[in-house]
């Protein structure tokens, strides 16, 4: 029997039942490699509470249709007194990426999964040349899912401060250059997920091979390698490779575009700080609303409830389905059943079944999918209780006053599936928006202006046009709602600009769209503020103008008009200046745009060195000076000593040339002991200094060796700009 979804065959996939602490391993074409589940298990269930394994689907007992895979077993189970076999059922829906199998629910006998994937699409329009799984579960079974970052056309430009080359990447799949309007990518070879553009030429420097990996819980890693045998002439005989490390942002709130952190011998190290790398909670509720502070999610489906005897009707060929959400169906022939979903046979309307009851309801928000499940309906002939799964999709232009209507999509073993497009399923997630702008290779980052939490304070705009008695206070935050503190305490919760006067407070606009580069300045538009009459809402424009060295000046109110519907502010700030790379001497570096000066000379040890230990090695490093430790070479800035035999390697000659770019200060030591390879590549050290105001001098942390460079990270207060 041919594999039904060949694109999904190369991997063993994972799904999780978080409520019951169960991890499922799924291999839809072969068997999972888990001894405890037997040699032919396609779906293996690992119960972490009881530390037991059970096969809940056998690869030999597979049956498939276009949208459903069933794996039976020979294991008996008891449901409602009838004898059945344990089985797994995977319902497939068309998606735009390979996607992830999602656990839906489990009864005594059936384990239900749903999988939105390109493999289930009738047409190949979303299918990639090369794509790998793009999610992982951590030890606590929390999901980290990068699928939302996958670009279906075009690519991400990696921020690398090199004007002569541009590195473009996609996440977990190759770059689709055909559908991308940008001419730069047209020359990229097919299959590449990392494309280096030099002048008019484009080179494949990496293709996806393995899925996303979790390293040390807080970091996800994706590796691309060049498959072709031919070497690239600018790589000094090395094979190109790309490693992208995705980092869940810390409280420091760094930017959210991929940054090149190391580049030597065509080994590209990219760090990408993004909220998609954080774990995504599964939010569940037994009511019709749910909210999750961590994701900034708030959902309420109660406006969809029908009353006064009316229901939603969905046509299912032989049957009509009468549905209500957040309440029982009040159709006459259903109402004794306390049904939320009521199934009526068209040819015989006396045949009425409850396909899920209002009291047995679960609303789940998981990885961007909003699902309402109704359990506990009338039994089928097999003994299973009918159940309905409604997948909600956001549609801001849905009919029926935005409510939309449910559409029956199919039935699988007495489980009825519906999709429902409605504006009430729209969830604005904070990850969607960047706090910066790009203009070709030029990059702008406004994150220095963001105020996150107390003791920070909102920016207050200057308004010289008013007398003290009629004074309005204008509180502004950038890319973030205003903090409800001080005079802004009464401001509407989601306002990014707020006006406060003696009559109260007003929302002058929300952060809904990312900043834009316009006419040499950065424009930030806040919209959807309070009503201002004639069905209009208040809108605010902020024009940010580059002023090197100034992160202290406040925004200024320029105009307000259209009957209080429009406000315009101007803000002269260093945050609106283009990011540029600067190099310094004598252990200092000056960022001329922002006006920051950094001096790391207090970290230099006049005698000795900083010692960092790992299991096998001791590392000795100094900052802007040589290590003076036996047995290290006297002019080395860093050296490595094997614990077993004291063998020593010079990891680079010391120097005091710091470089600064976008909040990162780096010190590079080159020309160390050559490797014993063809090219005799000299070892090098890269120390990245990051701001931590509490750390004092701080300490170096060894991160990893990537081919020829030893990477250290160092949080220190000396890497912090003077606070404005």
């Amino acid at each position: 029997q041919a594999a039904p979804f060949p694109e999904l065959c190369s991997y063993t996939w994972e799904a999780v039942d978080t409520k019951n602490n169960v991890l499922y391993k799924i291999n839809i074409c072969g068997s999972v490699d888990i001894v405890q589940c037997g040699p032919s298990s396609a779906v293996c269930m690992h119960d972490l509470k009881t530390r037991t394994y059970h096969s809940v689907g056998d690869s030999v007992l597979r049956s498939a249709t276009r949208s459903l895979l069933e794996f039976n077993t020979t294991v008996s189970c008891d449901q409602q007194g009838t004898n059945h076999r344990v089985q797994s059922s995977i319902a497939f829906l068309c998606g735009k990426t390979l996607g992830t199998p999602e656990f839906v629910t489990a009864t005594e006998c059936v384990h239900y999964f749903e999988w939105r994937t390109t493999a289930a699409c009738k047409k190949d329009i979303f299918k990639a040349n090369k794509e790998v799984p793009c999610y992982v579960f951590d030890e606590e079974l929390r999901k980290h899912d990068l699928n939302p970052l996958i670009k279906l056309s075009g690519a991400y430009l990696v921020d690398d401060s090199d004007p002569d080359t541009s590195l473009f990447i996609n996440v977990c799949r190759d770059i689709d250059t055909l559908r991308d309007p940008g001419s730069q990518l047209r020359a990229c070879p097919p299959g590449t997920a990392a494309c280096l553009v030099r002048g008019h030429q484009a080179f494949d420097v990496g293709q996806p091979r393995d899925g996303l990996k979790l390293v040390r819980k807080d970091r996800l890693v994706l590796s691309y390698v060049r498959e072709e045998a031919g070497k690239l002439d600018f790589c000094d005989g090395h094979s190109p490779a790309v490693t992208i490390t995705f980092v869940c942002p810390s409280e420091r709130r760094e930017g959210t575009i991929p940054k090149l952190t190391a580049k030597s011998n065509c080994r590209y190290e990219i760090e990408w700080i993004t909220e998609y790398a954080c774990h995504r909670d599964y939010l569940e509720s037994k009511t019709c609303s749910l909210s999750g502070e961590q994701q900034d999610v708030s959902i309420d489906l109660t406006p969809l409830a029908q009353s006064g005897g009316s229901s939603y009707i969905s046509d299912g060929k032989e049957y009509l389905f009468y549905l209500n959400v957040c309440g029982e169906t009040e159709i006459q022939f259903c109402n004794k059943k306390q049904a939320a979903v009521c199934q009526v046979k068209k040819s015989d309307t006396s045949q009425v079944k409850a396909a899920g009851r209002y009291h047995n309801q679960t609303l789940r928000y998981s990885d961007g999918d909003l699902t309402l499940i109704y359990f506990g309906g009338d039994e089928c002939s097999s003994g299973f209780q009918r159940m309905s799964v409604i997948n909600f999709e956001c549609n801001k232009t849905a009919g029926n006053d935005g409510k939309g209507t449910p559409v029956f999509t199919g039935e699988v073993d007495c489980t009825y599936f519906f999709t429902w497009d409605t504006e009430y399923a729209c969830v604005k997630e904070k990850e969607d928006l960047l706090c910066g702008a790009t203009d070709g290779k030029k990059r702008y980052d406004l994150s220095a202006l963001v105020r996150h939490a107390e003791p920070e304070q909102n920016w207050e705009a200057v308004d010289g046009s008013q007398t003290e008695t009629e004074k309005k206070h204008f509180f502004i935050n950038i890319c973030h709602r205003v903090l409800q503190e001080g005079k802004a305490r009464g401001c509407p919760e989601d306002a990014a600009v707020c006006a406060v006067d003696k009559n109260g407070s007003k929302n002058l606009g929300k952060f809904i769209s990312s900043p834009m580069k316009e006419k040499g300045n950065i424009q930030l538009s806040y919209s959807d503020g309070d009503d201002c009459g004639h069905g209009k809402k208040i809108k605010t424009n902020i024009t940010l103008v580059c002023k090197p060295g100034d992160l202290e000046s406040a925004p200024v109110l320029r105009t307000s008009g259209e009957g209080g519907c429009f406000y315009e502010f101007e803000w002269h700030t260093a945050a609106a200046c283009v990011l540029s790379k600067t190099e310094g001497e004598n252990c200092t570096v000056f960022d001329s745009q922002a006006g920051f000066s950094f001096d790391l000379s207090p970290l230099t040890k006049k005698n000795g060195a900083y010692k960092v230990e790992t299991k096998k090695y001791d590392f000795y490093i100094n900052v802007c000076g040589p290590v003076s430790v036996s047995p290290c070479q006297p002019d080395s800035g860093a050296c490595q000593v094997a614990k077993s035999d004291e063998k020593t390697w010079n990891l680079g000659l010391s120097n005091a040339k710091l470089s600064y770019y976008d909040g990162m200060i780096q010190l590079n030591y080159r020309g160390g002991t050559p490797y014993n390879n063809e090219r005799h590549t000299p070892r090098a050290t890269l120390i990245t200094f990051l701001c931590d105001r509490d750390a004092g001098v701080g300490f170096p942390e060894y991160q990893e060796e990537d081919n020829s460079t030893y990477n250290f990270r160092w949080y220190t207060s000396y890497a912090c700009p003077e606070e404005p």
Partner: nanobody, 114 residues
Framework: EVQLVESGGGLVQAGGSLRLSCAAS????????MAWYRQAPGKEREVVAA???????YHEGSVQGRFIISRDNAKNTVYLQMNSLKAEDTAVYYC????????WGQGTQVTVSS
């Protein structure tokens, strides 16, 4: 709520030993670099030792060979074994977690009498 609770401090004679513990709760412990800092009266707070989430270890020069930092991810605890204590080691010792967020403990007093 994140909490770091230090224990094990006290009064000890020069040349003696103490073992400090710092129990963490409310955070994904294994993702954090854990460090011990100390602050002697009238002096700035300084780092003593640190252990990263990838188990790279740092000891400040003045304590090398005498102090040993270690961690037990299963117990969400970081330790500082202090041997051959000197009068200049007298200080309040603070535990610090640095990762997706930064947190400090309240401190534990170590007094070394000569």
């Amino acid at each position: 709520e994140v909490q770091l609770v230090e224990s094990g401090g006290g009064l000890v004679q020069a040349g003696g030993s103490l073992r400090l513990s710092c129990a963490a709760s409310g955070l994904t412990f294994s993702s954090y670099t854990m460090a011990w800092y100390r602050q002697a009266p009238g002096k700035e707070r300084e780092v003593v030792a640190a252990i990263s989430s990838g188990d790279s270890i740092y000891h400040e020069g003045s304590v090398q060979g005498r102090f040993i930092i270690s961690r037990d991810n299963a117990k969400n605890t970081v330790y500082l074994q202090m041997n051959s204590l000197k009068a200049e080691d007298t200080a309040v010792y603070y535990c610090r977690a640095n990762g997706p967020g930064t947190y400090w403990g309240q401190g534990t007093q170590v007094t070394v009498s000569s």
